[in-house]
Structure formats: C-alpha cells, structure tokens
Amino acid sequence: LEVSESPGSIQVARGQPAVLPCTFTTSAALINLNVIWMVTPLSNANQPEQVILYQGGQMFDGAPRFHGRVGFTGTMPATNVSIFINNTQLSDTGTYQCLVNNLPDIGGRNIGVTGLTVLVPPSAPHCQIQGSQDIGSDVILLCSSEEGIPRPTYLWEKLDNTLKLPPTATQDQVQGTVTIRNISALSSGLYQCVASNAIGTSTCLLDLQVISPQPRNIG
C-alpha cells in the first residue's frame, strides 16, 4: 500500500470549501479498507482530533466541530479518500493526516500529510490619533485590524492630490503607524489606512485637524 505524496499545503479563504487530497495504490481489493483523517490544530497542537472515519463499510463522524461540514469527495470504498471541508473556519487551520489501512496489503507508506491554512481578510481597521494636534507637536496615526491571516500590512496615505504623506512623516507598514513630526497647517486633512493581505483589503479614515495657537490679547 502506498499513499501518494500530497501537495504539502493548501490555503483557502475562510468560509470557502477546502479539499484535502489523499490517494493510494494497493494490491488488495478494497473490502477491508480503513481510513482515519486526523487533524493537529495549529491552535492546540497537543490535542489531535478525528475528522472523519471509514471502517467496515460504515462512515463515522469525527469531532463535533466538523459535523455536517466534512465528507469524502467520492463514494467509498475507493483509492481516492480525499475529503472536503465546507465553510472553513479559522480553527480548521492545522496539519491533516489520512491514515489508510487495507489488509492484507501491508508495508509501504500508509500516511498522507497535508497542511491547511485558513486565510482571513483584514477586518475593518480601527484608526486613531495619538498625541496633541497643536501646531508644532508630533502625532502618531495608529491603524490596526483585529482579524487578518496572513497578518495584514498597513499603508497610510493622505487623501489629497498627491496621496503622499507629509515630508516629516515616517511610516511603519508592519505596525500600522505613521509618525508625523512638527505638524503644521499643511499636515491637516483626511488620512486613509489600507489594511491588506493576500486575500483582501479594508480601510479606515481619519481626519487630522492641526490646531493653530490662539492670538493672545494684550491688556
């Protein structure tokens, strides 16, 4: 019995279906086929879970969180024991193993391994200003999304004709911050943060209004 090499890893957007491949060759008839799909979740590597099982002509469900979402892609028994997972969740990310037994065919590689990564587009980021908006001050524009896999990068731009940040601004696209030093009236305006990753983008807006000093009355 020999389980074929798998593609290594599969990426899928959250909510979309995933197909985890597992095919094998065997010298024996498929009358005593046993298949177990297991997952070692990324979120809990110490707790492997059963996904779906086939034994003695019957299908058995695995962990309750997979109920109604998982099945074999074809009619069993077969040498293609790939499974589908519908409505993929973030918690489905992990390392999946198909373990195949088909007595009396023993020996060879009876395990196939496929990684599944469920990708999540950035959630609507939260924009905020840190620091005084008085002229001459330094301010930091902050942007962060609660969700996003892979981790989003953040691009700040000023919504004017140039889309360029002020010359005194420095940007950290990983942290999602822009530091603008010595703000002036020219620093005022709408700023947009674009959070993006491999499968999506999301934005937020921030209105920076630099406060000019009030003229003082001399009595």
């Epitope: 046993n34 177990i36 034994q55 003695g56 002509g57 019957q58 299908m59 058995f60 469900d61 309750p64």
Partner: antibody
C-alpha cells in the same frame, strides 16, 4: 454513570407503528454513533440500524429497510427508532447500543454500551 | 452478508473447567471480531474486541484468539458468574452480524 434507557415498546397489531426512544446519560452523546440491535424471544442478536453522531450517515439491515427510520436529537441526548408496517417477525427486545471506534488493526468499531432493552410485540 | 457460525451451540461445564467457544466466518474478516456475554433477562456485555483485546474491567480469565476466518473465545477457569450465552460479532463489513450464540450451562 454511562447509561442508555429505552422506552416506547409495547403490543401493536401487524401493519401498525411504534416509536422507540433511548435516553442517554453519563457521556457526550453527540460524539458517538448509535445503533439499534434486536433479539427475538429465545433467539440471537440482530443488528437493525446505525446512525453517525451528526446524523450524516445512516445504515439499515435489509430486513427493516423502508419500514424503520432511525434518528437522533443531540440536544436532548436521545435516539429514536420509528417502526412502521410492523410484522410478526419484528417481535423482539430492542436494545439501544453505543458504537465506539478503537485503534486496533487500523481501526475497528465495537458495540460497547447497551441499554436494558424494550419489548416490542407484534400480534393480532 | 457475512455469516458467523458458532460451535458448539451449547455446552455443559463445571466450575474451574477450561472452556473454548469457536466462531467461524464465511469469509476472511481480518480480526474484526468481537465477543459478548449475555445473561438471562440482561443486555449483552462486551468482553473481547479486535479478536484478542480484553475490554476494560473484564477478568483476565477471558481471552480471544484467531485470524482470518477462525476465532476462539477461551475461559481459562470457569466461574459461577460465567454461566451465560456468548455471541461473536463481526465489524468487518456492513451489515454487522452476530453468531447464533453458545450457551454455557452448569454440568
């Protein structure tokens, strides 16, 4: 304590219907496949039907196919067997039985927990 | 469906005797064989699974062996509480089937 308690048995005329229930306690019902197994008076055991934990997969013995329907309600920890078009040969004690999958020979399935049974008599 | 033939259908034995019960399958079932004990008016109880593995809590005087089509349940030293009917059952394929039983009676 792990327990299965059947109810709903009784006397019914040929062609009649009956619904058996099984109340489970002491284990996570929603994680296990469940079965009905019957035993005619003075006879051996006969597997009747199986249902997987999520109700995705259902199996019947040829002798009851098209007449019996197995179902479950995981929220109520309950297993059911709706029996229609009953015949005299359906007379038996009906057991509610849990299946477990054990890691042996790859995997194998076993009837590990049995209820006390409920008697169904089909007679005119 | 796979047929399981148990022999003998009944036997008489004394406390302390060694008892063996045979179960023959109509085709190779690759050790997917389980044994159950049933006392009068009671539900069956799992003794042995996968041909030779002892279920938790079952006394070690019970053992199972066999391969392919031929399987055996052995009680090394019969105790008073062992007088009962014993069934073999295969989980190799659907439908799951049982043998007709072997009744162990007091001599």
């Amino acid at each position: 304590e792990v327990q299965l308690v059947e109810s709903g048995g009784g006397l019914v005329k040929p062609g009649g219907s009956l619904r058996l229930s099984c109340a489970a306690s002491g284990f996570t019902f929603s994680s296990y496949s469940m079965n009905w197994v019957r035993q005619a008076p003075g006879k051996g055991l006969e597997w009747v039907s199986s249902i997987s934990s999520s109700s995705s997969y259902i199996y019947y013995a040829d002798s009851v196919k098209g007449r019996f329907t197995i179902s479950r309600d995981n929220a109520k920890n309950s297993l059911y067997l709706q029996m229609n078009s009953l015949r005299a040969e359906d007379t038996a004690v009906y057991y509610c039985v849990r299946s477990i999958i054990v890691q042996a020979l790859g995997i194998t399935s076993v009837f590990d927990i049995w209820g006390q049974g409920t008697m169904v008599t089909v007679s005119s | 469906a796979i047929r399981l033939t148990q022999s003998p259908s009944s036997l008489s034995a004394s406390v302390g005797d060694r008892v063996t019960i045979s179960c023959r399958a109509s085709q190779i079932i690759s050790n997917h064989l389980n044994w159950y004990q049933q006392k009068p008016g009671k539900a069956p109880k799992l003794l042995i699974y996968a041909a030779s593995r002892l279920q938790t809590g079952v006394p070690s005087r019970f053992s199972g062996s066999g391969s392919e089509t031929d399987y055996t349940l052995t009680i090394s030293s019969l105790q008073p509480e062992d007088f009962a009917t014993y069934y073999c059952q295969q989980s190799y394929s659907n439908p799951r089937t049982f043998g007709h039983g072997t009744k162990v009676e007091i001599k």
